[in-house]
């Protein structure tokens, strides 16, 4: 009679993470008597995956009933496959012995490869806001994929970026991999509505890449431009001065009026108007009673935007051009902000 052979017909098996792997094995004879064992890897460090004789294997099921006397099918199924299960599996026949069974013959091995999807890319930007014309860095991370081959692209508003560096770790063999990429983006004043997108393509995604996004509204700070103008005289002894604060982002803004260097009024931007590009405009006005001033008045509009150092714009109010009203001792009238916006 021909000597028993252990046949593993599949040289390799490819399984998606979470699915069940079937590892096929048959013996050509019932003799010698003894159990079958499955191992991952070879040599002294091999891992026992299934033992027909003893042990408890909650992830493994046999394809056929191994208790039947004439059974020669020793195929197994391993459920809930993860990348950690990748490796070469050997079906090994043992000969009954005393006190221990003796290894008799091994199959050629089946390499189990596991395909695992990458996690959703996470994009993160700089910790502090930056202003237009500055270059900022964005990072993108995705984990847990296998095999190692992966493609990562960066986009800004649909336009592909070229200034980025990408690493896939670890460099050597591993059960799963991670990707880390850093892209450099130059900010413009129009970027409040812009998005940076990291796109990851992998064989497991079947042509439908994963995307992670970051809104540049979280990153950009557009400083305001200021213009102080004197409006036509409302009454004989009153002058209306406006400070137009234009094209700023984010909204957090505090404005202070100074008359000859002395604080006249402070207010916080509340009712703003939004421009098409996502920036804001706001206007504050001050009613100055010129009859209270003997000399020219220097009016300053001072703006502190988003916690940054204050910027200011001044306007010289010529008092001599206006008749003085006797008996008035009010320097300025607290009027609050005007809800009209002047462009």
């Amino acid at each position: 009679e021909e000597e028993l052979q252990v046949i593993q017909p599949d040289k390799s098996v490819l399984v998606a993470a979470g699915e069940t792997a079937t590892l096929r094995c048959t013996a050509t004879s019932l003799i010698p008597v003894g159990p079958i064992q499955w191992f991952r890897g070879a040599g002294p460090g091999r891992e026992l995956i299934y033992n027909q004789k003893e042990g408890h294997f909650p992830r493994v099921t046999t394809v056929s009933d191994l208790t039947k006397r004439n059974n020669m099918d020793f195929s197994i199924r391993i459920g809930n496959i993860t990348p950690a299960d990748a490796g070469t599996y050997y079906c090994v026949k043992f000969r009954k012995g005393s006190p221990d069974d003796v290894e008799f013959k091994s199959g050629a091995g089946t390499e189990l490869s596991v395909r695992a999807k990458p996690s959703a890319p996470v994009v993160s930007g700089p910790a502090a806001r930056a202003t237009p014309q500055h270059t900022v860095s964005f990072t993108c991370e995705s984990h847990g994929f296998s095999p190692r081959d992966i493609t990562l692209k960066w986009f800004k508003n649909g336009n592909e970026l070229s200034d980025f560096q990408t690493n896939v770790d670890p460099v050597g063999e591993s059960v799963s991999y991670s990707i880390h990429s850093t892209a450099k983006v130059v900010l413009t004043r129009e970027d409040v509505h812009s998005q940076v997108i990291c796109e990851v393509a992998h064989v497991t995604l079947q042509g439908d890449p994963l995307r992670g996004t970051a809104n540049l509204s979280e990153t950009i700070r557009v400083p305001p431009t200021l213009e102080v103008t004197q409006q036509p005289v409302r009454a004989e002894n009153q002058v209306n001065v406006t400070c137009q604060v234009r094209k700023f982002y984010p909204q957090r803004l505090q404005l202070t009026w100074l008359e000859n260097g002395n604080v006249s009024r402070t207010e916080t931007a509340s009712t703003v108007t939004e421009n098409k590009d996502g920036t804001y405009n706001w206007m504050s006005w001050l009613l100055v009673n010129v009859s209270a001033h003997r000399d020219d008045v220097k009016l300053t509009c001072q703006v502190e935007h988003d916690g940054q150092p204050a910027v200011s714009k001044s306007h010289d109010l010529k008092v001599s051009a206006h008749p003085k009203e006797q008996g008035s001792n009010t320097a300025a009238e607290n009027t609050g902000s005007n809800e009209r916006n002047i462009y």
Epitope: E54, G55, H56, P58, R59, G79, N80, T82, P99
Partner: antibody
Amino acid sequence: QVQLQESGPGLVKPSETLSLTCTFSGFSLNTYDIGMGWIRQPPGKGLEWIAHIWWNDREYYNSALQSRVTISKDTSKTQVSLKLSSVTAADTAVYYCVRIDYFGSGQAWFTYWGQGTLVTVSS
Amino acid sequence: EIVLTQSPGTLSLSPGERATLSCSSSSTISSTYLHWYQQKPGQAPRLLIYGTSNLASGIPDRFSGSGSGTDFTLTISRLEPEDFAVYYCQQGSRIPFTFGQGTKLEIK
């Protein structure tokens, strides 16, 4: 830390069905290689394994009790249940909820035990 | 099913003495599948030794285990007052998992 708490009726009538619940905390039964089971101990006697269920829903039963026993898990509620039908006085015992861990290479053992609940079968 | 037989049924010793508890299996089992538990009165059992000779977490090293095939031993080198309890061996070699009937270690 890991905690297991059995609950159920202290007294069951013969021929009725015994229902026990084990509420656990400190771990998840969604985790690979973790299972939950039941072991009982009649007063003054030894330990008898009844059944256990793994994270992947595979169930194992003691063949001496299998026709009367059902084990189930509710992962969302972090609970495991045991039902034992057609009870007799021989089913009177302290019932322990246990966590069983799989350590690879066919090795599994009972790592954590509840304090046990005494169930008496009597009319 | 695999039947585990523990001996002696009761062991009477004094603190400081050495205790040797035996567990015999009706079938040959690999040493990796034989475990020991300790149970004190009114308490649940707790894992003492796994895989014949490995101490579970928090178990003092006066406990040790040995054996192979069908014969396994639990040894306590110097008995402490808190060691007096019932000890059970358990096999995880085959379903159904089974326990020995227990050895009661009592103070002499």
